[in-house]
């Protein structure tokens, strides 16, 4: 089938990094500067993405692959292919419509992005709290109380209910 197709369509022989040039008898021409074709058989090359403004270049464009962007320092990528940027916060914070806010008691965030999440409730797994949680770190659960001293019991209070965090736009 491939052989038949190439006899019918000479463009199918053009590899990635080239395009099938109708102006030159359908021969395979290299993509011009600042353009690419990531698959074979293309009739045009696409213009490379430019990482400007809030974006900076993570990977340069080549004749066979598009440029890749990330965000300027203090911001991180969101969306398919880094189509937008979002402000970083410190660990122990989350981004709200009013900017970075500290995590409420009973919640934590160990990253510069995302929302504060409730501490693990050790007692649900029959375990006890070995290390208390902070704004930046989850609690560390240890062996169950029964493993430590027979007959003893320890109950970890459940994490407080909270509204889901907002992402500022």
């Amino acid at each position: 089938f491939e052989r038949t197709r190439s006899l019918q369509d000479p463009c199918s022989n053009c590899p990635a990094g080239t395009f099938c040039d109708n102006n030159r008898n359908q021969i395979c021409s290299p993509c011009p500067p600042n353009s690419f074709s990531s698959a074979g058989g293309q009739r045009t090359c696409d213009i490379c993405r430019q990482c400007k403004g809030v974006f900076r270049t993570r990977k340069e464009c080549s004749s066979t692959s598009n440029a890749e962007c990330d965000c300027t320092p203090g911001f991180h990528c969101l969306g398919a292919g880094c189509s937008m940027c979002e402000q970083d916060c410190k660990q122990g914070q989350e981004l709200t419509k009013k900017g970075c806010k500290d995590c409420c008691f009973g919640t934590f965030n160990d990253q510069k992005r995302g929302i504060c999440r409730p501490w693990t409730n050790c007692s649900l797994d029959g375990k006890s709290v070995l290390v208390n949680g902070t704004k930046e770190r989850d609690v560390v659960c240890g062996p169950s109380p029964a493993d430590l001293s027979p007959g003893a019991s320890s109950v970890t209070p459940p994490a407080p209910a909270r509204e889901p965090g907002h992402s500022p736009q």
């Epitope: 045009t44 696409d46 213009i47 490379c48 993405r49 430019q50 400007k52 403004g53 809030v54 974006f55 911001f75 969101l78 969306g79 398919a80 292919g81 189509s83 937008m84 940027c85 979002e86 402000q87 736009q169």
Partner: antibody
Framework: QVQLQQWGAGLLKPSETLSLTCGVY????????WSWIRQSPGKGLEWIGE???????EYNPSLKSRLTISIDTSKNQFSLKLTSVTAADTAVYYC????????????WGQGVLVTVSS | KIVMTQSPATLSVSPGERATLPCRVS??????LAWYQQKPGQAPRLLIY???TRATGVPARFSGSGSGSEFTLTISSLQSEDLALYYC?????????FGGGTKVEIK
């Protein structure tokens, strides 16, 4: 809340220089890119160019030879100069802030109608 | 430069009905697209960026979708205050370019 206020001459003769200034009130001036965009009945919305606090500029190639965008960080202002204007430059000119999130425009000035006529 | 095509130029929709506004791009641009609303005598207002993320204060009836070279702005239930011009804008490449706009009017 960020506000952009723009001013400049509204009536020009052919071959004169268009000069507009945009003042930025509220928000952070030094961390954004600032743009000029124009809107004419024939051409719709056309991006003219942009500048950041360091004075780095990007210009629309179609206007580059006649265009200067500058910035005065001490006054929180940026300016547009377009030389050798013709009737084709008649448009409403807007200044706008490029968002933190993407190269789209989240705050706009009120617009100034510039008419080029002999 | 990248060419943005918005068709139809005018869209007539009954109040409460869904309005679907397409934007076609001359090549793939990922999700690097924004939508604006412009009412007479006013500057454009950012509605959507990243193809589908609503800007601050934009009602939930506005939604964006698509990627590559085909994008859509949808107004789920048209209100009288939504009568305006709508523009798409790409930011995959400089110069940044806008579509010619679609005017939404009451049927």
């Amino acid at each position: 809340q960020v506000q952009l206020q723009q001013w400049g001459a509204g009536l020009l003769k052919p071959s004169e220089t268009l000069s507009l200034t945009c003042g930025v009130y509220g928000g952070s001036f030094s961390t954004n890119y600032w743009s000029w965009i124009r809107q004419s009945p024939g051409k719709g919305l056309e991006w003219i160019g942009e500048i950041n606090h360091s004075g780095n500029t990007e210009y629309n190639p179609s206007l580059k030879s006649r265009l200067t965008i500058s910035i005065d960080t001490s006054k929180n202002q940026f300016s547009l100069k377009l030389t050798s204007v013709t009737a084709a430059d008649t448009a409403v000119y807007y200044c706008a802030r490029m968002g933190y999130h993407s190269p789209s425009f989240d705050f706009w000035g009120q617009g100034v109608l510039v008419t080029v006529s002999s | 430069k990248i060419v943005m095509t918005q068709s139809p130029a005018t869209l007539s929709v009954s109040p409460g009905e869904r309005a679907t506004l397409p934007c076609r791009v001359s090549q793939g641009i990922g999700s690097n697209l924004a939508w604006y609303q412009q009412k007479p005598g006013q500057a454009p207002r950012l509605l959507i960026y990243g193809a589908s993320t609503r800007a601050t204060g934009v009602p939930a009836r506005f939604s964006g979708s698509g990627s590559g070279s085909e994008f859509t702005l949808t107004i789920s239930s048209l209100q009288s205050e939504d009568l305006a011009l709508y523009y798409c804008q790409q930011y995959n490449n400089w110069p940044l370019t806008f579509g010619g706009g679609t005017k939404v009017e009451i049927k």
